[in-house]
């Protein structure tokens, strides 16, 4: 805390400029008017104030705006944003995407800090939903942003926003998140033709049900093994050998290398060994010839 002392004669700041970097902390406190600082916040970023001097400037703004800074000040905080605590940010009402971008720029190239997470949360809650422009901005700065949201939060993403999602944005999503995103993606891309549709939907297929995988198998999509390995096990199990062969196309040979891993392992256990042999890959572990397969889940559903 800086002591309250009178400003020395001739040192009263008329504007926020470079001369202030030579002021001691107590001089900044005494000689810089908080209202002047607020109206000239855009200049602070261009002036190499020390860490301690920035403490004084923040303190002045906090005194001027105890209920939280107005957006006109927030937009020009620049690197002073890095001094803010999540508690400070919770008092803000940020509505402009330009303000959000300006503050994210300061943290660019770094992990999402608690301050940034709070800022984004305030912004998205204020907007009511994750619209396309917001999602575009957030995933540009934080590719993993989408996968940091809960399935409940993802449910507020409108299908139109899915166009902003890049494959790498989904890298860390778990199946529960993809379950929410997949139907939105399906809706968003529904008017595209076969091959273009597959390119767009591919990253979301970890949330696809069996019937959609069966439909894709009829379209010569040549799904790669990496995508296949991310499919829901329960969606893959009912697929026939012929359907998997059509789905993977030339990539079907990759099944051999993955035969011990889910979902391939579990799928093999459900197939007739005769059918697996038709692939010519030496896959083992299928149901021996002559055995009868009872689908107990179907029987339970009927009773």
């Amino acid at each position: 805390e800086v002591e309250k002392t009178a400003c020395p004669s001739g040192k009263k700041a008329r504007e926020i400029d470079e001369s202030l970097i030579f002021y001691k902390k107590w001089e900044l406190e005494a000689c810089v008017d908080a209202a002047l600082l607020a109206t000239q916040m855009d200049r602070v970023n261009a002036i190499p104030f020390t860490y301690e001097q920035l403490d004084v400037l923040k303190h002045k703004l906090d005194e001027l705006y105890p209920q939280g800074y107005p957006e006109s000040v927030i937009q020009h905080l620049g690197y002073l944003f890095l001094k803010m605590s999540p508690e400070d940010i919770r008092k803000w009402n940020v509505t402009s995407l330009e303000t959000l971008k300006a503050l994210l720029e300061v943290n660019k190239g770094h992990e999402m800090s608690p301050q940034v997470a709070t800022l984004i949360d305030r912004f998205v809650k204020g907007r009511g939903q994750l619209d396309k422009d917001t999602l575009d901005t957030l995933t540009a700065f934080y590719p993993g942003y989408l996968c940091s949201l809960s399935p409940e939060e993802l449910s507020s993403v409108p299908p139109s926003s899915i166009w902003a999602v890049r494959p790498q944005d989904l890298d860390t999503c778990d199946p529960r998140q993809l379950d929410v995103l997949y139907p939105k993606a399906r809706l968003a891309f529904q008017n595209m033709n076969g091959s273009e549709y597959f390119v767009k939907i591919q990253s979301f297929l970890g949330g696809a049900p069996t019937e959609d995988l069966k439909a894709l198998s009829q379209q010569n999509v040549s799904m790669d093994l990496a995508t296949f390995m991310k499919l829901r096990t329960d969606a893959v199990l009912p697929l026939t050998v012929a359907e998997v062969q059509k789905l993977l196309g030339p990539h079907v040979e990759g099944l051999k290398a993955e035969e011990r891993h889910r979902p391939v392992r579990d799928w093999i256990l459900r197939q007739r060994q005769d059918d697996l042999d038709t692939l010519g890959l030496g896959l083992q572990g299928g149901i021996p010839n002559g055995y009868l397969v009872l689908d107990l889940s179907m029987q339970e559903a009927l009773s």
Partner: nanobody, 118 residues
Framework: QVQLVESGGGLVQPGGSLRLSCAAS????????YGWYRQAPGKQRDLVAI???????NYADSVKGRFTISRDNSKNTLYLQMNSLRAEDTAVYYC????????????WGQGTQVTVSS
């Protein structure tokens, strides 16, 4: 980690010159500004000169026209050329740099003693 090592200090007569150097290493981020501070015995540390990433320089009134700050990016070295030295320039001189992207952090060297005396 970031290391700033000053050199070039020493004893000099009034009116003489010295050139301080500061070798920086371990910098893996964009630097916002480099500077020189000094601290005389029993006094607070004061900013002497600063140079921004864009090359803009600023000087304390007491050294304007006598001191020149510069840097050599290829050698990762900061300099302070001090001419027309006075007794009141006697102090420990510290090299300093600012990080302002991703985190706010100021880095300081250990200091080099400059004594101006006849």
């Amino acid at each position: 980690q970031v290391q700033l090592v000053e050199s070039g200090g020493g004893l000099v007569q009034p009116g003489g010159s010295l050139r301080l150097s500061c070798a920086a290493s371990g910098i893996t981020f964009p630097v916002n500004a480099y500077g020189w501070y000094r601290q005389a015995p029993g006094k607070q540390r004061d900013l002497v000169a600063i140079i921004s990433a864009g090359g803009t320089t600023n000087y304390a009134d007491s050294v304007k026209g006598r001191f020149t700050i510069s840097r050599d990016n290829s050698k990762n070295t900061l300099y302070l050329q001090m001419n027309s030295l006075r007794a009141e320039d006697t102090a420990v001189y510290y090299c300093y740099l600012q990080r302002r992207i991703g985190m706010l952090r100021d880095y300081w060297g250990q200091g080099t003693q400059v004594t101006v005396s006849s």
